[in-house]
């Protein structure tokens, strides 16, 4: 189960971003740092260090067009990607409790 301030790597990180960002999609780097041709901002922050809900949400794509860098669209994952986390390490109830606690 996901716990705040733990490392998230690989597929587990993608799954979690999908869940947090929903239909908005997400970036692997924030708009301001999209100069690198191979952006792995969130990988460095969440996998090699640790991250929480607030940090994860900064990588979600912004719904308002005017705030989005349209030159680099948010991630659109292939059809075979699960819409929500599928790993047995990820439990919806635990995530829900964590997000509610962090938002208080």
């Amino acid at each position: 189960a996901y716990r705040p301030s733990e490392t998230l790597c690989g597929g587990e990180l993608v799954d979690t971003l999908q869940f947090v960002c929903g239909d908005r999609g997400f970036y692997f780097s924030r708009p301001a740092s999209r100069v690198s041709r191979r952006s792995r901002g969130i990988v460095e922050e969440c996998c090699f260090r640790s991250c929480d809900l607030a940090l994860l949400e900064t990588y979600c794509a912004t719904p308002a067009k005017s705030e989005r860098d349209v030159s680099t669209p948010p991630t659109v994952l292939p059809d075979n990607f699960p819409r929500y986390p599928v790993g047995k390490f990820f439990q919806y109830d635990t995530w829900k409790q964590s997000t509610q606690r962090l938002r208080r």
């Epitope: 998230l8 690989g10 792995r40 991630t75 790993g87």
Partner: antibody
Framework: EVQLLESGGGLVQPGGSLRLSCAAS????????MNWVRQAPGKGLEWVSS????????LYADSVKGRFTISRDNSKNTLYLQMNSLRAEDTAVYYC???????????????WGRGTLVTVSS | DIQMTQSPSSLSASVGDRVTITCQAS??????LNWYQQKPGKAPKLLIY???RLQSGVPSRFSGGGSGTDFSLTISSLQAEDFATYYC?????????FGQGTNLEIK
């Protein structure tokens, strides 16, 4: 040519230290996360350690945590593994491996060095 | 940690045979599964990533399948150069773990 070349292996006594190097060429080293993977004689593959592209983040297997230190020098296109307090069970061929570009949002080791043998014995 | 279990551990086959190696994960890893080939004295070589995607330059006789906890690597028609040890590896979470290997020998 795109390649990784390890060096620094050899025979060392238990409790001793060794520093492995991995020289990268033919690609932009500074934008790839890098890894060390080892293989004991006649055994399978075991992930040892990873370092982020900038060198700002590291991860270690429990079996080497506190004894091994991974680092990199992007100006020299070189990856390092400092191994201290070596044990007999650390005897293995050590490979450096490049992490995949995540444009596909998958992770895999797409480039490997030929390996360097570390033998820990008295 | 996620445990990866391969079967069989060893397999004897002939040139032209169709062979399948399986890999089971102790937890659901979606399709975050890679396959590597290793020949004696050589470094591993990536064959397949994301469970079924063929790495560039790998012959089409290699194919991968599966999702969740059960995966397979199939070689449709064995060639002499395919006799080697094959490893699966999960990339769902750290530590990235490998299967124990399947040694494919010539019959």
């Amino acid at each position: 040519e795109v390649q990784l070349l390890e060096s620094g292996g050899g025979l060392v006594q238990p409790g001793g230290s060794l520093r492995l190097s991995c020289a990268a060429s033919g690609f932009t080293f500074s934008v790839y996360d890098m890894n060390w993977v080892r293989q004991a004689p006649g055994k399978g593959l075991e992930w040892v350690s990873s370092i982020s592209s900038s060198g700002g983040g590291t991860l270690y297997a429990d079996s080497v945590k506190g004894r091994f230190t991974i680092s990199r020098d992007n100006s020299k296109n070189t990856l390092y593994l400092q191994m201290n307090s070596l044990r007999a069970e650390d005897t293995a061929v050590y490979y450096c491996a490049r992490d995949s570009d995540t444009s596909s949002y998958y992770w895999y080791y797409d480039l490997w060095g030929r390996g360097t043998l570390v033998t820990v014995s008295s | 940690d996620i445990q990866m279990t391969q079967s069989p551990s060893s397999l004897s086959a002939s040139v032209g045979d169709r062979v399948t190696i399986t890999c089971q994960a102790s937890h659901d890893i979606s399709n975050y599964l890679n396959w590597y080939q290793q020949k004696p004295g050589k470094a591993p070589k990536l064959l397949i990533y994301a469970a079924s995607r063929l790495q560039s330059g790998v012959p089409s006789r290699f194919s991968g399948g599966g999702s969740g906890t059960d995966f397979s690597l199939t070689i449709s028609s064995l060639q002499a150069e395919d006799f080697a040890t094959y490893y699966c590896q999960q990339s769902y979470s750290f530590p990235r773990t490998f299967g124990q290997g399947t040694n494919l020998e010539i019959k």
